[in-house]
C-alpha cells in the first residue's frame, strides 16, 4: 500500500508568492511559493495519485503583515482552502498568546491541530478541550493512518503560550500516544512536529512504533541529488534514520516560506511496516502557475493590507537617527529602539531568579536602511517602519558562548571607518572600543546586563558562560562577515518579523524618545 | 515468535565461494536491518555488512566489499551472504543477526 | 569509521560483587549502543538497547549508562550464568562497530 505524503512547515505568513529568497515579490516572473502556487501542485498530485495527505509542521504564524493584519485568520481561511488533512502547533501559534490560536485557527481550523506533548491545566483545559488533539487517525483511501503531534518544549522561551499549557518532553509524551494508536489497530503512523531536526532525529530512534517523521522548527533543506536552488542540502531527502529497534525510519522536512512542498512516496507492507520510501521536495517556482481563484481571493484579502501600512502605530517626538553615517560609526537612537523593541518582544519566563530569560541584543548597523523625521507630526507607519527594515528577516533567539560574543565584537570594529554594515548596534550591553589598537584587540570592556538577578546591573562578560542573545537572523546565519556567529552558536530559535516586533513595541509605547546613551564608547 | 535459523556448516576450497542463508520468521521481513557478523575462533566480532530487504540497500564495512556480497528474497524470507575468493582467513563462524536476535551461526571452514 | 574500545578486555570477579564494562566511542553515537552476551556455546543475547534501556527478561542487576563519549554495562551482583563474553554495538552510523570485547571469568 503507498501512501503520499505532501507537507509543508515554517510557512510563516508567505501566503503571497515571494522572491527567491523569501522575501516580497517583486520580479513575477520569478517568484516563488505562495498558496495559490501550491493549490495548483497539490490539486494536480492529488488527481494523479490514490492516497495523499497534506500536513503542516506548524509556524504558519508570524511573518509578514499578513499576520499583523488578520492575525491567523488568513491561516485557517487558506489551509482550509488548500484542504490541509491535518497541522501541528508550532511555536508560533502561540504569539498572540492561547487566546490569538483559539479564536482564529483552532476553532475555524477544518482540518485536526494537533500536539501531545502540551497539556492544558486548570481554567484553560476545559475551554480549549478538543480544539486540539494528541493524534487523529485519518482515513486515506481503504486504510486508516494515525498522525500524532508534538511541539517545542522550548516554547515557553520562545512565544507567549501562558502559564496554563505544560510542554512536556516529546519523546516521553509521545510514546503513549503512539502505543494507545497500536491498541486501535493503527499501524501506519506519522509523527508530525514542530521541534527541529535534531529532535525529529531522535524521534525517529526511539519512538517504536513511529513510521515516519515529518519536521519543521529548523527550516531544514533536504534533497537528494541536485539542489533546484540556492539552499544547500543538510541530507539526504528522505533523511533515514535507524531506530532502536532496527527499522529505517524516513525524516522529511521542506525548508520554510512556502517555497518548497515536500513530497514522500511511502510504501507500506500489510502489517503497516515501511518498506520503501522516496521523495524530493518540489520547488514551486514560476513553472508552476497560481490557482486563479485562490489567486482571485488573496487579492480579496490583500486591499485590507495596503490601508493597515498607512495607519498611525504610534508617534515619535525626536528624530528616529537611522543614516548609515550614524549608524554604521556610533551608538544611533534607531538602533536603540530597534534592540529595545528586540529585547522587549522577548519578556518572558522571569521567576523568583530570574527578571527575563534574555537581557541582550546585537543588530549590524547595516540592517538599518532608513531614519524617521519627527517633523511628520510624529506618526509611524507600518510603511515607514518598512523602510527601515526593508528585508523581512526575523529577530532570533540564540545561545552563544561569551567568547563567540567577544569575537562578534571585534568583528564588529575590525575595519572601522569604511561605512561597513557589521558595526553593531547594542542593548542590555555596554562595549567600550580602543581603535588605536590593532583590528581583533580593540575591544577594552565589554559588560553584559544580568538576567539571574532582581535588579538588571551590568557585569563583565565571561568568556566561558553561556548567554542568550536576541539578533537579526542575518546575524545568526553568518551575515555580514559574523562567520563566529553561525559557526560557534550553541542553540538558533527563530523568532517575530523584525517589523513585527517593531511595530508592536511603538503601538505598546504610543509615544516614543529613543536617546543616544552611551552603550557604545 | 522471531526466529532466525541459518544455513549448516561449510567446507570450502580456497578460491571457491560459498552461499550462507538465513531464514527469518515471525516478524515483518522486509522492514528491518539484516546484519551479518563474523566471529573467527576465541576472537570478537567484526560487523560485516546489513541489508535492508525492504528497498534492497545494502551497507558495507570496507574491508568486507568484494568479499561478501548481501542478498535479499522477500518471497521466503530469506537473507543471504555470499563469500568468494575464499582464504584461510575466511575460517570463522558467520551470524546474522537483528538489533535484538541473532542466528546459531555458520561455520565456515576453508581447507585445501 | 567510528572505533570503539572497550575495556578491561579480561576481568575476574567473585559472585556477588558488582563489576562496570565500558567502551569508549571516537565519535558522538548518541544513544546508540547496544550491549550483547554471548554464552560459551557461541549464543548471542542482546541485553542493553539505546545505551540504557534493558531488553525484556534481562534481569534487572544489568544496568547501561552513558557518561560523555564513554558507555558502561554495570552488573550490580554477579551471578554464576554472568561469567561469559560481553560486547557493545554501535548503530550510530554505518558501518557499524564492535568493541573488542570482555571476557568475564569467575575469581
Known amino acids: 500500500w503507498e501512501l503520499t505524503i505532501l507537507h509543508t512547515n515554517d510557512v510563516h505568513s508567505r501566503l503571497e508568492q515571494t522572491s527567491e529568497d523569501s522575501s516580497k515579490c517583486v520580479n513575477a516572473s520569478r517568484c516563488m511559493g505562495g498558496v495559490a502556487r501550491l493549490f495548483t501542485k497539490v490539486q494536480q498530485i492529488r488527481r494523479a495519485e490514490p492516497n495523499v495527505l497534506l500536513l503542516d509542521a506548524g509556524d504558519q504564524y508570524q511573518g509578514t503583515i499578513w499576520f499583523t493584519v488578520y492575525k491567523g485568520a488568513e491561516v485557517a481561511h487558506f489551509m482550509n482552502a488548500l484542504r490541509y488533512d491535518a497541522m501541528a502547533l508550532g511555536n508560533h501559534e502561540f504569539d498572540n498568546g492561547v487566546e490569538g490560536l483559539i479564536e482564529p485557527l483552532l476553532k475555524e481550523a477544518k482540518f485536526p491541530i494537533l500536539s501531545a506533548n502540551i497539556k492544558a491545566k486548570g481554567p484553560l483545559a476545559s475551554q480549549i478541550s478538543g480544539l486540539y488533539l494528541p493524534y487523529k487517525v485519518l482515513p486515506v483511501g481503504d486504510e486508516v493512518v494515525g498522525i500524532v503531534g508534538y511541539t517545542s518544549k522550548e516554547t515557553p522561551f520562545l512565544s507567549n503560550p501562558g502559564t496554563n499549557l505544560v510542554f512536556e518532553d516529546e519523546i516521553t509524551a509521545l510514546q503513549p500516544e503512539v502505543d494507545k494508536l497500536k491498541t486501535l489497530n493503527v499501524n501506519k503512523i506519522i509523527a508530525l512536529g514542530h521541534s527541529g531536526f535534531e529532535t525529529d532525529k531522535l524521534i525517529a530512534q526511539k519512538v517504536r512504533g513511529v513510521d515516519v517523521v515529518v519536521g519543521g522548527h529548523s527550516n531544514t533543506f533536504l534533497y537528494t541529488g541536485n539542489p533546484p536552488s540556492k539552499e544547500v542540502p543538510a541530507g539526504k531527502y528522505p533523511f533515514i534514520v535507524t531506530s532502536d529497534d532496527g527499522r529505517k525510519v524516513p525524516v522529511v522536512q521542506a525548508y520554510a516560506f512556502g517555497k518548497y512542498l515536500g513530497y514522500l512516496k511511502i510504501e507500506f507492507d500489510e502489517r503497516g511496516n515501511v518498506i520503501s520510501s522516496h521523495g524530493n521536495p518540489i520547488l514551486l517556482n514560476s513553472s508552476i502557475p497560481e490557482d486563479p481563484s485562490i489567486k482571485a481571493d488573496i487579492n480579496k484579502w490583500r486591499i485590507k493590507l495596503d490601508n493597515y501600512s498607512t495607519q498611525e502605530l504610534g508617534k515619535t517626538i525626536v528624530y528616529l537617527d537611522g543614516s548609515s553615517q550614524s549608524c554604521r560609526f556610533r551608538e544611533c537612537n534607531m538602533g536603540n529602539l530597534i534592540c529595545d523593541a528586540m529585547i522587549n518582544n522577548n519578556l518572558r519566563h522571569a521567576d523568583e531568579m530570574f527578571w527575563n530569560h534574555v537581557s541582550m541584543c546585537i543588530l549590524n548597523g547595516g540592517g538599518i536602511r532608513s531614519p524617521i523625521d519627527e517633523r511628520n507630526n510624529g506618526t509611524i507607519t507600518w510603511e515607514n517602519l518598512a523602510a527601515v527594515l526593508p528585508f523581512g528577516g526575523t529577530f532570533d533567539l540564540v545561545q552563544l558562548k561569551g567568547s563567540t560574543l567577544k569575537k562578534a565584537f571585534e568583528h564588529s570594529v575590525h575595519r572601522y571607518g569604511q561605512s561597513t554594515g557589521e558595526f553593531l548596534q547594542v542593548g542590555g550591553i555596554h562595549v567600550v572600543y580602543d581603535l588605536s589598537r590593532k583590528p581583533g584587540d580593540r575591544v577594552v570592556k565589554l559588560d553584559v546586563l544580568c538576567t539571574k538577578c532582581r535588579v538588571p546591573s551590568y557585569d563583565p562578560l565571561k568568556m566561558d558562560e553561556i548567554y542568550k542573545v536576541i539578533l537579526p537572523n542575518f546575524l545568526a546565519n553568518g551575515g555580514d562577515g559574523f562567520q563566529m556567529i553561525k559557526d560557534e552558536l550553541l542553540r538558533h530559535d527563530s523568532g517575530d518579523q523584525d517589523i513585527n516586533v517593531v511595530s508592536t513595541y511603538i503601538s505598546k509605547m504610543k509615544v516614543i524618545y529613543p536617546a543616544v546613551e552611551g552603550r557604545i564608547k | 515468535q522471531i526466529q532466525l535459523q541459518q544455513s549448516g556448516a561449510e567446507l570450502a576450497r580456497p578460491g571457491a565461494s560459498v552461499n550462507l542463508s538465513c531464514k527469518a520468521s515471525?516478524?515483518?521481513?522486509?522492514?528491518?536491518?539484516m546484519q551479518w557478523l563474523k566471529q573467527r575462533p576465541g576472537q570478537g566480532l567484526e560487523w560485516i555488512g546489513a541489508i535492508y530487504p525492504g528497498d534492497g540497500d545494502t551497507r558495507y564495512t570496507q574491508k568486507f566489499k568484494g568479499k561478501a556480497t548481501l542478498t535479499a528474497d522477500k518471497s521466503s524470507s530469506t537473507a543471504y551472504m555470499q563469500l568468494s575468493s575464499l582464504a584461510s582467513e575466511d575460517s570463522a563462524v558467520y551470524y546474522c543477526a537483528l538489533f535484538s536476535y541473532w542466528g546459531q551461526g555458520t561455520l565456515v571452514t576453508v581447507s585445501a | 569509521d567510528i572505533q570503539m574500545t572497550q575495556s578491561p578486555s579480561s576481568l575476574s570477579a567473585s559472585l556477588g560483587e558488582r563489576v562496570s564494562l565500558t567502551c569508549r566511542a571516537s565519535q558522538d553515537i548518541g544513544s546508540s549502543l547496544n550491549w550483547l552476551q554471548q554464552e560459551p556455546d557461541g549464543t548471542f543475547k542482546r541485553l542493553i538497547y539505546a545505551t540504557s534501556t534493558l531488553d525484556s527478561g534481562v534481569p534487572k542487576r544489568f544496568s547501561g549508562s552513558r557518561s560523555g563519549s564513554d558507555y558502561s554495562l554495570t552488573i550490580s551482583s554477579l551471578e554464576s550464568e554472568d561469567f561469559v563474553d560481553y560486547y557493545c554495538l554501535q548503530y550510530a552510523s554505518f558501518p557499524y562497530t564492535f568493541g573488542g570485547g570482555t571476557k568475564l571469568e569467575i575469581k
Open positions: 515471525g516478524y515483518s521481513f522486509t522492514s528491518y536491518w
